[in-house]
């Protein structure tokens, strides 16, 4: 149930390998910075995606069934107390906005999480259960394919995924309040 997921995310992550990141060939990563969007809108070039009409129950189900497990696997070998949660969200569309931004927008020290399994599943669940979201991803996907990546592990990516876990937990909690 929900409590099991919450407890699994509170306890110390089991031992294992750290997360990986894909960085540009010049090793500098990307200069794009992560910004907060409290409106529930995601900037995609000139297009803003509004998460208001998503099927939140279906997204919750996908998260609890599979995405949460991949996030925890990524964090294996670290303690949940290793990182402080600095990113928050106030409602379901805002939580999805922050989750989308943190998962797919490159940051200086964690260039891309987009190839990770949890990210691929996040993209799939948003594409499936958020009307019109897939259309906004067509050009973004084509642009991403043109960038050659190589894997590097960074502590900053672990911190970013820790923030993602917190955002997803917040998303579930805001969903519970509504029911």
């Amino acid at each position: 149930g929900l409590n099991d997921i919450f407890e699994a995310q509170k306890i110390e992550w089991h031992e294992g390998g750290g997360g990986s990141d894909y960085k540009d060939d010049d090793d500098k990563g990307s200069s794009h910075h992560h910004h907060h969007h409290s409106s529930g809108l995601v900037p995609r070039g000139s297009h803003m995606y509004d998460f208001t009409n998503c099927d939140f129950q279906k997204i919750e189900a996908d998260y609890l069934r599979t995405i949460s497990k991949d996030l925890i696997t990524y964090m294996s070998g670290t303690k949940s107390t290793d990182f402080n949660n600095t990113v928050s969200c106030s409602n379901r569309p805002h939580c999805l906005t922050e989750i989308q931004s943190l998962t797919f927008n490159p940051t200086p020290r964690c260039a891309s999480l987009a190839k990770e399994m949890f990210a691929r599943k996040t993209k799939a669940t948003l594409a499936l259960w958020c009307p019109g979201y897939s259309e906004t991803q067509i050009n973004a996907t084509q642009a991403m394919k043109k960038r050659r990546k190589r894997k590097v592990t960074t502590n900053k990516c672990l911190e970013q995924v820790s923030q993602l876990l917190g955002l997803w937990r917040r998303f579930i909690r805001t969903l519970l309040k509504k029911q």
């Epitope: 069934r65 799939a124 009307p131 259309e135 996907t141």
Partner: antibody, heavy 120, light 107 residues
Framework: QVQLVQSGPEVKKPGSSVKVSCKAS????????MHWVRQRPGQDLEWMGT????????DYNQNFKGRATITADKSTSTAYMELSSLRSEDTAVYYC?????????????WGQGTLVTVSS | EIVLTQSPGTLSLSPGERATLSCRAS??????VHWYQQKPGEAPRLLIY???QSISGIPDRFSGSGSGTDFTLTISRLESEDFAVYYC?????????FGRGTKVEIK
């Protein structure tokens, strides 16, 4: 190359069930959802539902909810569509079609179709 | 459920002519419309996706346009192999739906 090969034609009695298979090859099975679409004789295309292997989840057209079950065996890259409580109106060609769930997002490859005839 | 209305039901044209097929959605669906061609006894074949995106291997005489609720598939110069039924489909939200089709027949 991408191929979706469906099982052969079926003749069924009213009230019985049919299970149609769709064997995928030439691509990574979990990168795509498998949709099922039917076409009754001389009629339009009707979306029945989908199974998303990446997320282990499915979604159905309400018109078929309770009667249609869509599953997949990831180890053999095969999707299945089972339709129960068959009636004569279910006589149709049933198609499987793949759709990317992390890219493309469109039904870009289709099976050859499976004719299911429901007759007493 | 989003309803897609295609018009005309049948289009009678000669080879070399221009074909304009319409698809209207019952609500705003941005550009989440795809076009398929179907010939008798065959599975549908994808022609255009997300209103105007072209598919490799599809002749460039096929083009799509539109957004919101009104969409158009244009065949600039009809070839003999283009006489078939054309369907629009929306993937904006579940349940996915198809239009009733436009039959392009030889005049």
């Amino acid at each position: 190359q991408v191929q979706l090969v469906q099982s052969g034609p079926e003749v069924k009695k009213p009230g019985s069930s049919v299970k149609v298979s769709c064997k995928a090859s030439g691509y990574i099975f979990t990168d795509y959802a498998m949709h099922w679409v039917r076409q009754r004789p001389g009629q339009d295309l009707e979306w029945m539902g989908t199974f998303i292997p990446l997320l282990d989840t499915s979604d159905y057209n309400q018109n078929f909810k309770g009667r249609a079950t869509i599953t997949a065996d990831k180890s053999t890259s095969t999707a299945y569509m089972e339709l129960s409580s068959l009636r004569s109106e279910d006589t149709a060609v049933y198609y499987c079609a793949r759709m990317g769930v992390t890219h493309s997002y469109v039904m870009d490859a289709w099976g050859q179709g499976t004719l299911v005839t429901v007759s007493s | 459920e989003i309803v897609l209305t295609q018009s005309p039901g049948t289009l009678s044209l000669s080879p070399g002519e221009r074909a304009t097929l319409s698809c209207r959605a019952s609500q705003h669906i941005s550009r989440s419309v795809h076009w398929y061609q179907q010939k008798p006894g065959e599975a549908p074949r994808l022609l255009i996706y997300f209103a105007s995106q072209s598919i490799s291997g599809i002749p460039d005489r096929f083009s799509g346009s539109g957004s919101g609720t009104d969409f158009t598939l244009t065949i600039s110069r009809l070839e003999s192999e283009d006489f078939a039924v054309y369907y629009c489909q929306q993937s904006y939200s579940f349940p996915y739906t198809f239009g009733r089709g436009t039959k392009v027949e030889i005049k």
